[in-house]
Amino acid sequence: YDFTNCDFQKIEADYLRTISKDLITYMSGTKSTDFNNTVSCSNRPHCLTEIQSLTFNPTPRCASLAKEMFARKTKATLALWCPGYSETQINATQAMKKARKSKVTTNKCLEQVSQLLGLWRRFIRTLLKKQ
């Protein structure tokens, strides 16, 4: 999906109002220094591409974050503010929901969510630069 036509201001507002709180709740008990940020992004569409990938694409040691509250809210936000997102992406993520057997917050998942927080911060910084 090409995130170029998204309403970035509205995505930022949703992130600051609600998604960020759920990401921080998920990370509770860990320190910001516990993980190194290895994933980066260069502009707003690129940041959303990386956020989409890290949130919804399963990785070997963190099967899927797609059922987490922050992921559901991310999906809703992208569906609302990125025209055409739902048609291309939602069905693709339904299968990932089923892949998730039990709710175990592994260290690898915490690391992945830490990367997500970094990507969202970068998304907001690139937004501020543009204004």
């Epitope: 949703d14 109002r17 609600t18 559901r72 809210k73 809703a76």
Partner: antibody, heavy 120, light 111 residues
Framework: QVQLVQSGAEVKKPGSSVKVSCKAS????????INWVRQAPGQGLEWLGV????????IYAEKFQGRVTITADTSTSTAYMELSSLRSEDTAVYYC?????????????WGQGTLVTVSS | QSALTQPPSASGSPGQSVTISCSGS?????????VSWYQQHPGKAPKLMIY???KRPSGVPDRFSGSKSGNTASLTVSGLQAEDEADYYC???????????FGGGTKLTVL
């Protein structure tokens, strides 16, 4: 079963406000969009706005900006539509309608409608 | 942004086909594949008949079909039946600001 049940008919004076409720049952309320659509007597459908409780987003039709407020109480699975500064032209049947989960722009479930009459 | 444009009336005899048009712009119908059609019988709430231009919800007869060309969407009812007599409304997503637009409605009469 899966349904939207709206509050009863209202008669209001010009200049006052009306608040219509829409109680959802049989589905996960927060994930869907709850839209409000009205229909004046003998007229077509007119979209007022939508709320997506999951992310707390509301979008209003430009025509009603500043006059309509849509809220939701996820604990009771109820959405509300308040219209202020009522005038006779606001006399209509007001419907709540469910916008599909993540596909908020089509309405697959409708309430029974609430008749709001504005008259002095 | 104004409402989508529909003919006020359409008619056909039982068994015939009738097509209702819905004209918009590149900002709504032409810009997205997010057109819906609703059927409304007198005194009843509207019912979703077609969504995303041409998809039918379960329970809607396959006599109802939707299509789109440029800025105009169409609803075709084939093999007209008496119970198809109703008002039909088109609707389109219209971007993140306007969000939803409705057509003025078409009264379908089965002769």
């Amino acid at each position: 079963q899966v349904q939207l049940v709206q509050s009863g008919a209202e008669v209001k004076k010009p200049g006052s406000s009306v608040k219509v409720s829409c109680k959802a049952s049989g589905f996960t309320f927060g994930s869907y969009g709850i839209n409000w659509v009205r229909q004046a007597p003998g007229q077509g459908l007119e979209w007022l706005g939508v709320i997506v409780p999951l992310v707390g987003v509301t979008i209003y039709a430009e025509k009603f900006q500043g006059r309509v407020t849509i809220t939701a109480d996820t604990s009771t699975s109820t959405a509300y539509m308040e219209l202020s500064s009522l005038r006779s032209e606001d006399t209509a049947v007001y419907y709540c309608a469910r916008g599909q989960e993540y596909f908020y722009w089509y309405f697959d479930l409708w309430g029974q409608g609430t008749l709001v009459t504005v008259s002095s | 942004q104004s409402a989508l444009t529909q003919p006020p009336s359409a008619s056909g005899s039982p068994g015939q086909s009738v097509t209702i048009s819905c004209s918009g712009s590149s900002s709504d119908i032409g810009g997205y594949n997010r057109v819906s059609w609703y059927q409304q019988h007198p005194g009843k709430a509207p019912k979703l008949m077609i969504y995303d231009v041409s998809k039918r919800p379960s329970g809607v007869p396959d006599r109802f079909s939707g299509s789109k060309s440029g800025n105009t969407a169409s609803l075709t009812v084939s093999g007209l039946q008496a119970e198809d007599e109703a008002d039909y409304y088109c609707s389109s997503y219209a971007g993140t600001d306007t969000f939803i637009l409705f057509g003025g409605g078409t009264k379908l009469t089965v002769l």
